[in-house]
């Protein structure tokens, strides 16, 4: 008779999650190992080239621990350098493989999350992960003591990668700068210099002069006036953060002059992930695990013409206004419609700029600023 086909057993969400996280950690471990080995090798290589002529018997000092009279056989040195080069290129290959694998895994991870939300497997409290209270401070730290950038600028014979790099070469004045992240054309950014370093302003609202109800391509490229209200652009933000984790600071102001500063540790994906924003570990020294959503869930960016939100029954961007990382449509939207006074109709009011856990779902905020600062490369997710 006909062969009885077994109905397939689908992996449970927990199993998928464990598998995905395991794979991500494995990729991360491999990448960290490759990075460590690579930096050890380049350090060794630097020491060998610094050693240079001294090791070959001509004059000049060396920082290698050689006895004053000792000399290294040039052949031995040459063979060492050849081995180093070969080792280095093997490490380079491994590094690229790991990075490739990492990207692939991140895509898989996102697909799993999408599938999950489509099949309604998600517990609804997971969807409202945005409600997790971030650490709060009233202001970004004040501007640090001025340092003369002229002392350090000779270190930078190209455009800076981001505001943090500008800060590192001594710039302490906030304002408009030209930057050029790796693999990106140059563009203009507002840098906010604080005692915590250089932050890139990615969004600013304060007077309603710019329409934020725009399509996907506008949110991708950026729009507005760098001197006034603007959205920097998802692609530009992603070019700044790359694969690194970043600190995201959100400054909110209400109509009574009260201000709030929220800080998160985040990871922003590329366009292939719909610029998904993932809340990662809490920022050091802040309120701890309350900052982290369950499972480190990623939320894709949505606009009225590209609906990636986690609601099956609704297009959040269309029913509200503007583009945002919409989870359930109800927690926050800093790119909503600007209201100078509170509209009477609740239906209209819900389209406004709001942050539910601060002033409430139906309070249109007066001003918002979003700033990002990539963390050191080793903090990458």
């Amino acid at each position: 008779g006909p062969v009885q086909s077994k109905s397939p057993r689908f992996a449970s969400w927990d199993e998928m999650n464990v598998l995905a996280h395991g794979l991500l950690q494995l990729g991360q471990g491999l990448r960290e190992h490759a990075e460590r080995t690579r930096s050890q090798l380049s350090a060794l290589e630097r020491r060998l080239s610094a050693c240079g002529s001294a090791c070959q018997g001509t004059e000049g000092s060396t920082d290698l621990p050689l006895a004053p009279e000792s000399r290294v056989d040039p052949e031995v040195l040459h063979s060492l350098q050849t081995q180093l080069k070969a080792q280095n290129s093997r490490i380079q290959q491994l590094f690229h493989k790991v990075a490739q694998q990492q990207r692939h895994l991140e895509k898989q991870h996102l697909r799993i999350q999408h599938l999950q939300s489509q099949f309604g497997l998600l517990d609804h409290k997971h969807l409202d992960h945005e409600v997790a209270k971030p650490a709060r401070r009233k202001r970004l730290p004040e501007m640090a003591q001025p340092v003369d950038p002229a002392h350090n600028v000779s270190r930078l014979h190209r455009l800076p990668r981001d505001c943090q790099e500008l800060f590192q070469v001594g710039e302490r004045q906030s304002g408009l700068f030209e930057i050029q992240p790796q693999g990106s054309p140059p563009f203009l950014v507002n840098c906010k210099m604080t005692s915590d370093g250089g932050w890139t302003v990615i969004q600013r609202r304060h007077d309603g002069s710019v329409d934020f109800n725009r399509p996907w391509e506008a949110y991708k490229a950026g729009f507005g006036d760098p001197h006034g209200e603007f959205w920097l652009g998802l692609e530009k933000v992603h070019s700044i953060t790359g694969d690194r984790n970043s600190r995201l600071a959100v400054q909110l102001r209400d109509w009574d002059g009260n201000a709030e500063l929220l800080q998160f540790s985040v990871h922003l994906g590329g366009e292939d992930t719909a610029y998904s924003l993932q809340l990662t570990a809490p920022v050091a020294g802040q309120l701890g695990a309350t900052t982290v959503p369950p499972s480190g869930l990623s939320v894709p960016f949505s606009t009225w013409d590209q609906d990636h939100d986690l609601r099956r029954d609704k297009n959040c961007a269309k029913s509200l206004s503007g583009g945002w990382w919409f989870g359930t449509c109800s927690h926050s939207n800093l790119n909503g419609q600007y209201f100078r006074s509170i509209p009477q109709q609740r239906q209209k009011l819900k389209k406004g700029i709001f942050w539910k856990t601060w002033r409430g779902r139906y309070y249109p905020l007066q001003a918002t600023t979003m700033l990002i600062q990539p963390m050191a490369a080793e903090a990458a997710s």
């Epitope: 500008l166 001594g170 004045q173 304002g175 408009l176 030209e178 140059p186 001197h227």
Partner: antibody, heavy 117, light 107 residues
Framework: EVQLVESGGGLVKPGGSLRLSCAAS????????MNWVRQAPGKGLEWVSS????????YYADSVKGRFTISRDNAKNSLYLQMNSLRAEDTAVYYC????????????????WGRGT | EIVLTQSPDFQSVTPKEKVTITCRAS??????LHWYQQKPDQSPKLLIK???QSFSGVPSRFSGSGSGTDFTLTINSLEAEDAATYYC?????????FGPGTKVDIK
């Protein structure tokens, strides 16, 4: 020594052209936006044009738009101002001035000035 | 464009006296206001940036204050070498604009 030296000024008939140059030395020229500011005889200062470190961002005063062109050559540490369709009201001392922030664009003070041409 | 007006146009002062020059902007410019000193037949020199920050190497008798639309440059205890024209400059909006200048001479 950190300095800016302008050259290329001269007498020209209305409708004529002139090219001003500014040679920079003593600092990393390619890291700064640069500007031209002019001063008519016995008058105040007037900003003319700005160019960002990579030449990506260029701005002009309305009074010179379409007639003047700012450019730079980072390899030669030089800034230029090509002035066409000159008018009597363009008569002035032209100063080359450096933006006060490395890689700054537009909203900065001028911390180093040439002697003018 | 943002128009800057300075007052007075001219001031004749005796050494050691205190000099106050004001600059008013036609609209709010935050603290994006800078002061320059220009001596006869010389190029301008930066004195104060961002309304109140002294530029390196500038004598401490020069100070600046203000924000929004009203700004002040103060020279405490004027010296003979301070005879010059003083200009304010806004960089908040393009085009950059300068005030008409205040000429300070020594009695």
């Amino acid at each position: 020594e950190v300095q800016l030296v302008e050259s290329g000024g001269g007498l020209v008939k209305p409708g004529g052209s002139l090219r001003l140059s500014c040679a920079a030395s003593g600092f990393t020229f390619s890291s700064y936006s640069m500007n031209w500011v002019r001063q008519a005889p016995g008058k105040g200062l007037e900003w003319v044009s700005s160019i960002s470190s990579s030449s990506t961002y260029i701005y002009y005063a309305d009074s010179v738009k379409g007639r003047f062109t700012i450019s730079r050559d980072n390899a030669k540490n030089s800034l230029y101002l090509q002035m066409n369709s000159l008018r009597a009201e363009d008569t002035a001392v032209y100063y080359c001035a450096r933006d006060g922030a490395i890689f700054g664009v537009v909203n900065w003070y001028f911390d180093l000035w040439g002697r003018g041409t | 464009e943002i128009v800057l007006t300075q007052s007075p146009d001219f001031q004749s002062v005796t050494p050691k006296e205190k000099v106050t020059i004001t600059c008013r902007a036609s609209q709010s410019i935050g603290s994006s206001l800078h002061w320059y000193q220009q001596k006869p037949d010389q190029s301008p020199k930066l004195l104060i940036k961002y309304a109140s920050q002294s530029f390196s190497g500038v004598p401490s008798r020069f100070s600046g204050s203000g924000s929004g639309t009203d700004f002040t440059l103060t020279i405490n205890s004027l010296e003979a070498e301070d005879a010059a024209t003083y200009y304010c400059h806004q960089s908040s909006n393009l085009p950059h604009t300068f005030g008409p200048g205040t000429k300070v001479d020594i009695k």
